[in-house]
Amino acid sequence: MAKAAAIGIDLGTTYSCVGVFQHGKVEIIANDQGNRTTPSYVAFTDTERLIGDAAKNQVALNPQNTVFDAKRLIGRKFGDPVVQSDMKHWPFQVINDGDKPKVQVSYKGETKAFYPEEISSMVLTKMKEIAEAYLGYPVTNAVITVPAYFNDSQRQATKDAGVIAGLNVLRIINEPTAAAIAYGLDRTGKGERNVLIFDLGGGTFDVSILTIDDGIFEVKATAGDTHLGGEDFDNRLVNHFVEEFKRKHKKDISQNKRAVRRLRTACERAKRTLSSSTQASLEIDSLFEGIDFYTSITRARFEELCSDLFRSTLEPVEKALRDAKLDKAQIHDLVLVGGSTRIPKVQKLLQDFFNGRDLNKSINPDEAVAYGAAVQAAILMGDKSENVQDLLLLDVAPLSLGLETAGGVMTALIKRNSTIPTKQTQIFTTYSDNQPGVLIQVYEGERAMTKDNNLLGRFELSGIPPAPRGVPQIEVTFDIDANGILNVTATDKSTGKANKITITNDKGRLSKEEIERMVQEAEKYKAEDEVQRERVSAKNALESYAFNMKSAVEDEGLKGKISEADKKKVLDKCQEVISWLDANTLAEKDEFEHKRKELEQVCNPIISGLYQGAGGPGPGGFGAQGPKGGSGSGPTIEEVD
């Protein structure tokens, strides 16, 4: 058997996508709803946990217990201003657990709190299951993507989420880098080209500039806004229609969470329509206090509502060009990634900025990141396809990395946008006479002073022999591996004594024990979900069978073929089952199956009697199989002497 494929997962803020490279090409895998992207939503109810479309579809009914935007929390501290700001806009509760944010929900009648890693792991589990359903075998190896601006803590936390989901995370790669890989596959062997990737998704915005030369990718610069995307455009539409509702009906719906949620869903639909039509209509029955809200919006009005947001996308473009030391005329290709790049105005602004240059839209913007991640997964698994074997990926450090030197100064060893993996060494010395040790404090960020940057970790190198200040030579090495994980080593050159740290942000990260616990819990939830799935499946089977039977015997075509007594018998039993179902939606699988078998025992002999000798089987969907003989199965054909 061919070896199991590795998958590429685009773990998005609002939607996620999974792909696999097999038979020389990438397949983006549709979920059980037929959608090639899956909402990054997890919902908790009194009876079950829902992930993906099912979770997003019931958000209006259960906003407090439907979690999304876990990506905005992952790897951050509770006190992080981003977390504090975002919390104001979420209907679910975020609590502080030792400066780690946790999402608090009500699940099966109990209050539960989950780390962002756990929520993300649930989404990843869903993506893993989507892939497994398609491939037909278990999947463990995966490449997962993150925004270019994710720091080490966020990358580590994403990796932890993968582990909790039962994945072996081959590598964490930047989303724009993944998109570049997808693009590069189509464009190998065309000489060195500078490519600007413009990724405007549901929740984040990333601009990256890369050079692609004969299958080798190098990221020259990244910029962006971790808080700009399709949802912001939805918000503008929501605010617009809230005001319109006020004008028309003199009522403020903004405090009614369910009404706003329903309006938001309609706005998202309208926004998508406006990418291909110049007008979209909204029809929401009984939106608020029984009032139906029927309205419409033009593309021009939408563009006006979002004009500042659309224009703001050009700032990171300019910044990336500056960082890459390139003029816009030096960009060969413009690549659109992310669903929001379908918006005509966004395309026009970008095209105008680049003096009418054509935009490359050959990649489905929703799928490009997963596409590239799938290719990268194949490379890491040693795929020998000629499509991928010559491809080399050079990723970058999203932020400068360095240490604190005297006076709280940030001394960078690895500059931001440096190609990784990379290793940099620098000699430092002591600040005081006879200083017995040095405290190495590792930071990431672009500010001059460490207090304005992000502390990743610290360690001490002690046992330095007494010497005047400036004499000892302390060699510090910063080594980033392909996953962007940092190892810092300090060595006293006079003694050879060394100490090191792997920056895993233990202060902000989960411990091995916690991850292990979460892996076990994820398994438990998976088992519970399976029980729930089976329960719902049994319920649906019973419901379908009952309604099929009912309509079968009520069919005018059966007049005269079925006795009134038999018809009554079937209808009475169907009525009993249908009413029982209505009253017992939360019954157990065994109960649903028992009722179905009871109903079949009544109906099957009657229904099959109708179709015997009619030259064909019973009506479709009835499962009206004939009697089984033997020990549950007898001879179906007899030998003729």
Epitope: D572, Q575, E576, I578, S579, W580, D582, A583, N584, A587, D590, E591, E593, H594, K595, K597, E598, E600, Q601, N604, P605, Q625, P627, K628, G632, S633
Partner: antibody
Framework: QIQLVQSGVEVKKPGASVKVSCKAS????????MNWVRQAPGQGLEWMGW????????TYADDFKGRFTFTTDTSTSTAYMEVRSLRSDDTAVYFC?????????WGQGTLVTVSS | EIVLTQSPDSLAVSLGERATINCKSS????????????LAWYQQKAGQSPKLLIY???TRESGVPDRFSGSGSGTDFTLSIDSLQAEDVAVYYC????????FGGGTKVEIK
């Protein structure tokens, strides 16, 4: 007339298996479900589960999942109940009962004694 | 799982007198669509197989004397034997078929 006739008394050792039969007559066997009910000495009735005689599908009560198996042979209109890995607390009278709106016809019962 | 609790455990009644047996369910046995309660009563005489008396709370099985009657709804049910005869000495069981099946613990009826 409708009748359910069960097999005779069984005496078995712990760990052995037993298969009780229930032969139906007087009606179309596959039109009605067949239930099995246990009654330990001096105790009440315990519903064990039933078999859909048309499809062969079974339902077992929680306490009877695992060691108990219901089958039918539609060619002889007979239902069977087998118990594996017999234990002393399986000592009981086992009844088969036809099900229409309720358990309207019962077999005479089969005493199964499990003793070392 | 639905639990049926019968009371009393045993009952001694004079010949010709009325015997009343109660059966309480842990959840309602009423189906709003069919307007029926899914409770049946069985009689088991010593050394014999059980016999169906009443189904759907109050519908007498054919051949059952009319001194046997059933009543109740939801969770509380009663079997009444209007004028106790000597041949009515037996153990009586209620049984629910609302979801899966379960029997009550039984009530022994004797002559006083």
């Amino acid at each position: 007339q409708i009748q359910l006739v069960q097999s005779g008394v069984e005496v078995k050792k712990p760990g052995a298996s037993v298969k009780v039969s229930c032969k139906a007559s007087g009606y179309t066997f596959t039109n009605y479900g067949m239930n099995w009910v246990r009654q330990a000495p001096g105790q009440g009735l315990e519903w064990m589960g039933w078999i859909n005689t048309y499809t062969g599908e079974t339902t077992y009560a929680d306490d009877f999942k695992g060691r108990f198996t219901f089958t039918t042979d539609t060619s002889t209109s007979t239902a069977y109940m087998e118990v594996r890995s017999l234990r002393s607390d399986d000592t009981a009278v086992y009844f088969c009962a036809r099900y229409d709106h309720a358990m309207d016809y019962w077999g005479q019962g089969t005493l199964v004694t499990v003793s070392s | 799982e639905i639990v049926l609790t019968q009371s009393p455990d045993s009952l001694a009644v004079s010949l010709g007198e009325r015997a009343t047996i109660n059966c309480k369910s842990s959840q309602s046995l009423f189906n709003s669509g069919t307007r029926k309660n899914y409770l049946a009563w069985y009689q088991q005489k010593a050394g014999q197989s059980p016999k169906l008396l009443i189904y759907w709370t109050s519908t007498r099985e054919s051949g059952v004397p009319d001194r046997f009657s059933g009543s109740g709804s939801g969770t509380d049910f009663t079997l009444s034997i209007d004028s106790l005869q000597a041949e009515d000495v037996a153990v009586y069981y209620c049984k629910q078929s609302y979801t899966l099946y379960t029997f009550g613990g039984g009530t022994k009826v004797e002559i006083k």
